[in-house]
């Protein structure tokens, strides 16, 4: 706000008041009179930058005039009163009501005195995002995407992300006339890494009161990757049972599991228990290549480990499951 | 009913001052400004000041600054306007004119002439 | 001094005519400008205010418009009892100026 004058009549508004689509707005104007001053009131006036004649009128023995009635009210002036707020409420505010407008004092002895308001019509934007499920593609692609619906003006769409990725945002009219709809990709090239880990999309726009956050949990669907554990190169002769799992991380998740070796079968000292494979006690040394194939949606990768079971002393010697 | 009402035409001699009066009813005298416009025969209208009856504050057309001279009497609802070392060419007819913005409402005029 | 030219200064018009009157500023006046209607022998009668709106008791074949410096008032059908001299103003900044006059004869 303007600070007051000295030893002068002036007219105090805010430089711009914004409004919302759809909603009602006040525009503040007020005259403020220095103590020892003394001024006579006898128009109020409203006037819109570019257009011609007055929007509302208050005239000290007129009362209000309105160029449009339904939507337009002065807000405290009153026929019989000292005129010296000159506010005014517009109802269902439109895009076109955007602009400047003039509000003026007519006054004595001092003359006209005015003050310009920017008027600034908002519509506050509905925010969602979603992961946009991919598979391995070798290519960047978009994993998340972000939308700012029926901003105005268009919302500001940002990523915030440790992995990388590059935005790719679009506009395009809301459905309200005037109205904006922010679209914004994230894009990067799909790994099995990426697969659960979080994106932010950050929207600001002038209607809120602080930044939006949205977060994405990403999708990257992938086959399985495989890899056998529990074996530590110390098998030996007599120790007891020992386990193996094989650890598969895929998207979906896998749906079976195979062992086998690379002589065809199991043998009888190897019992599959699902991603486990339980191996017995033995007598005598061996040395297998075991096979362990999973399956998901997206197709089957294996993993395969070559266990020794040497000749020697099972008493010290840790890296086996034992019961 | 608001109603202005002028006093009687003059005739004066040049370099002489005249006084018109304006005595008002029909509304609060001191919730309205007053204002003297002339216009002389057959010619357009002219603002020549006005006061506020409240604080006594004015505003005079710099044309006339110095020969005019607008005053009120808040008792009997009176404004005066006075217009010293008259000339010929001053010759009119002097209305008071309530003011609010515009003027609404208008006494019946008093002409004054000025002549040797 | 803000000059107000109206023109023309004179017109004649018949009963149910349309007429125009306009009204030039010399500057920027915004919307205040007002009208009068001067019948001979008689004090100016206030028409329009702030530029397009009407007083009350004024018929509303008298219509104001314009905003800036250029100023219209329009009798939409003129009548007999329209004959008159009428006068734009504006009250913007003093000191406080009229137009010339416009004479307004009835065919």
């Known amino acids: 706000w303007p600070p007051p004058g000295t030893g002068d009549v002036v007219v105090q508004a805010p430089t711009q008041v914004p409004g919302f689509l759809g909603d009602s707005v006040t525009l503040p104007c007020y005259l403020q009179v220095p103590n020892m001053e003394v001024t006579h009131v006898s128009q109020l006036t409203w006037a819109r930058h570019g257009e011609s004649g007055s929007m509302a009128v208050f005239h000290q023995t007129q009362g209000p005039s309105y160029s449009e009635s339904k939507r337009l009210e002065f807000v405290a002036a009153r026929l019989g009163a000292e005129l010296r707020n000159a506010s005014l409420r517009m109802f269902g505010l439109r895009v076109e009501d955007e602009g400047n407008y003039t509000c003026l004092f007519v006054t004595f002895p001092q003359g006209s005195r005015s003050v310009d308001i920017w008027l600034r019509v908002l519509a506050k934007p509905q925010n969602t995002a979603e992961v946009q499920k991919v598979q391995l593609t070798g290519e960047p692609v978009p994993m998340a995407r972000c939308v700012s619906t029926g901003g105005r003006p268009p919302a500001q769409i940002t990523w915030h992300s440790d992995l990388g990725g590059m935005p790719n945002t679009s506009q395009v009219p809301g459905f309200l006339s005037g109205t904006v709809t922010v679209t914004s990709l994230w894009i990067l090239v799909p790994s099995s890494q990426v697969d659960g880990k979080n994106v932010t999309c950050k929207v600001e726009h002038e209607s809120f009161e602080k930044p939006q956050l949205l977060t994405v949990n990403l999708t990257v669907y992938y086959p399985p990757e495989v890899s056998i554990s529990g074996y530590d190169n110390n098998w030996y002769l007599g120790q007891n049972e020992a386990t193996l799992t094989c650890d598969a991380r895929s998207n979906p998740e896998p749906t079976g599991y195979n062992w086998s070796t690379t002589m065809g079968p199991l043998p009888p000292f190897a019992v599959a228990q699902g991603a486990q494979l339980l191996i017995r006690p033995v007598d005598k040394p061996i040395n297998t290549t075991l096979i362990c194939n999973v399956t998901n949606a997206l197709g089957a990768r294996q993993a395969e480990l070559t266990v020794q079971v040497k000749e020697g002393p099972p008493s010290e010697h840790s890296g086996i499951s034992r019961n | 009913e608001v109603q202005l009402v002028q006093s009687g035409s003059e005739l004066k001699k040049p370099g002489a001052s005249v006084k018109v009066s304006c005595k008002t009813s029909g509304y609060t005298f001191t919730e309205y400004t007053m204002h003297w416009v002339r216009q002389p025969h057959g010619k357009g209208l002219e603002w020549i000041g006005g006061?506020?009856?409240?604080?006594?504050?004015?505003s005079y057309n710099q044309r006339f600054k110095g020969r005019v001279t607008i005053t009120v009497d808040k008792s009997t609802s009176t404004a005066y306007m006075e217009l010293s070392s008259l000339r010929s060419e001053d010759t009119a007819v002097y209305y008071c004119?309530?003011?609010?913005?515009?003027?609404?409402?208008w006494g019946q005029g008093t002409l004054v002439t000025v002549s040797s | 001094d803000i000059q107000m030219t109206q023109s023309p200064s004179a017109m004649s018009a018949s009963v149910g005519d349309r007429v125009t009157i306009t009204c030039k500023a010399s500057q920027n006046v915004g919307t205040n400008v007002a009208w009068y209607q001067q019948k001979p022998g008689q004090p100016p009668k206030a028409l329009i205010y702030?530029?397009?709106y009407r007083y009350s008791g004024v018929p509303d074949r008298f219509s104001g418009s314009g905003s800036g410096t250029d100023f219209t008032l329009t009798i939409s059908s003129l009548q007999a009892e329209d004959l008159a001299e009428y006068f734009c103003?504006?009250?913007?900044?003093?000191?406080?100026?009229f137009g010339q006059g416009t004479k307004l004869e009835i065919k």
């Open positions: 103003q504006q009250y913007q900044s003093y000191p406080y100026t």
């Open positions: 702030s530029a397009s």
């Open positions: 006061i506020h009856p409240n604080s006594g504050g004015t």
């Open positions: 004119a309530r003011w609010t913005g515009d003027f609404d409402y």
